[in-house]
């Protein structure tokens, strides 16, 4: 697992169950960069943090996956966690 993927997993594992559910719901509607598709809703909602990390990296690659994760965290009011994720990614 690369540095960015590990940082994504660390962030997702620090979410409460309620926050992880909210993260997934926001991920379904977050603005995406052109050329990227959305993770299918059915698959997304049943995933744990590890599966979700794998899916984010396979869909968006590590760099954009980390950026997208950070943006969803910011949308949730978790700016500090988003900043830590991006700092870990850019070390």
């Amino acid at each position: 697992m690369g540095r960015a993927a590990a940082a994504i997993l660390d962030a997702l594992e620090n979410l409460t169950a309620e926050e992880l559910k909210k993260f997934k719901l926001k991920l379904l509607s977050v603005p995406l960069r052109e050329g990227y598709g959305r993770i299918p809703r059915g698959a997304l909602l049943s995933m744990d943090a590890l599966d979700l990390t794998d899916k984010l990296v396979s869909f968006y690659l590590e760099t954009y996956g980390a950026e997208l994760t950070a943006n969803v965290l910011r949308d949730m009011g978790l700016q500090e966690m988003a900043g830590q994720l991006q700092a870990a990614t850019h070390q």
Epitope: R74, M76, Q79, E80, G83
Partner: antibody, heavy 114, light 107 residues
């Protein structure tokens, strides 16, 4: 249209404390505005899980709490001085993305005077 | 802390004019900028979020643009009811911060 309910005015003596309330939901922010000045963010609290974030400038004087049963957010402001005379707004972030403050209370005007 | 600088501080204008208000962030804030309108003795109201998304019920004469550090609020044809203070704010990092505001006044 969501209405955030805040009491209108509070008159307090220097050195005293005041507890401001706001009927709200989700993330609730507290924002200070002195007469003729800009907006200053004090901090916020998540009504569902109690998570808080503070502006370091206000951490020593502001304590954010929540009463889940009544969906009410509170900020206790302590050791008040004349510099703390201001309107204090509560605001919610309900828009799904970008975390703006989309609903605002009418504000509580706090006057610190002996 | 991220500093949001707004300019001009005030503008005198005539009804129907096109107005450009600017906001500069001290560091990259992506698109995490909102614009608020505040009339005298009233609480602020959200106009634009995510730099360019018009909030529900906001007239289409209000347009937001920009990203990273430079942001603009444009009012294509100012109406009397638009005379107010305008604040930009960032929600990219804590603490959340606002600009000092721009006051729109009648000439």
């Amino acid at each position: 249209q969501v209405q955030l309910q805040q009491p209108g005015t509070e008159l307090v003596k220097p050195g005293a404390s005041v507890k401001l309330s706001c009927r709200a939901s989700g993330w609730t922010h507290w924002v200070k505005q002195r007469p003729g000045q800009g907006l200053e963010w004090i901090g916020n609290i998540n009504l569902s899980n109690g998570r808080t974030n503070y502006n370091e400038k206000f951490r020593a004087m502001a304590t954010l709490t929540v009463d889940k049963s009544s969906s009410t957010a509170y900020t206790q402001l302590s050791s008040l001085t004349s510099e703390d005379s201001a309107v204090y707004y509560c605001a919610n972030s309900m828009v799904p993305h970008f975390f703006p403050m989309d609903y605002w209370g009418q504000g509580t005007s706090v006057t610190v005077s002996s | 802390n991220i500093v949001m600088t707004q300019y001009p501080k005030s503008m005198s204008l005539s009804i129907g004019e096109r107005v450009t208000l600017r906001c500069k962030a001290s560091e990259n804030v992506g698109s995490y900028v909102s614009w608020y309108q505040q009339k005298p003795e009233q609480s602020p109201k959200l106009l634009i979020y995510g730099a360019s998304n018009r909030y529900t019920g906001v007239p289409d004469r209000f347009t937001g643009s920009g990203s990273a550090t430079d942001f603009i609020l444009t009012i294509t044809s100012v109406q009397a009811e638009d005379l107010a203070d305008y604040h930009c704010g960032q929600s990219y990092n804590y603490p959340l911060t606002f600009g000092a505001g721009t006051k729109l006044e009648l000439k």
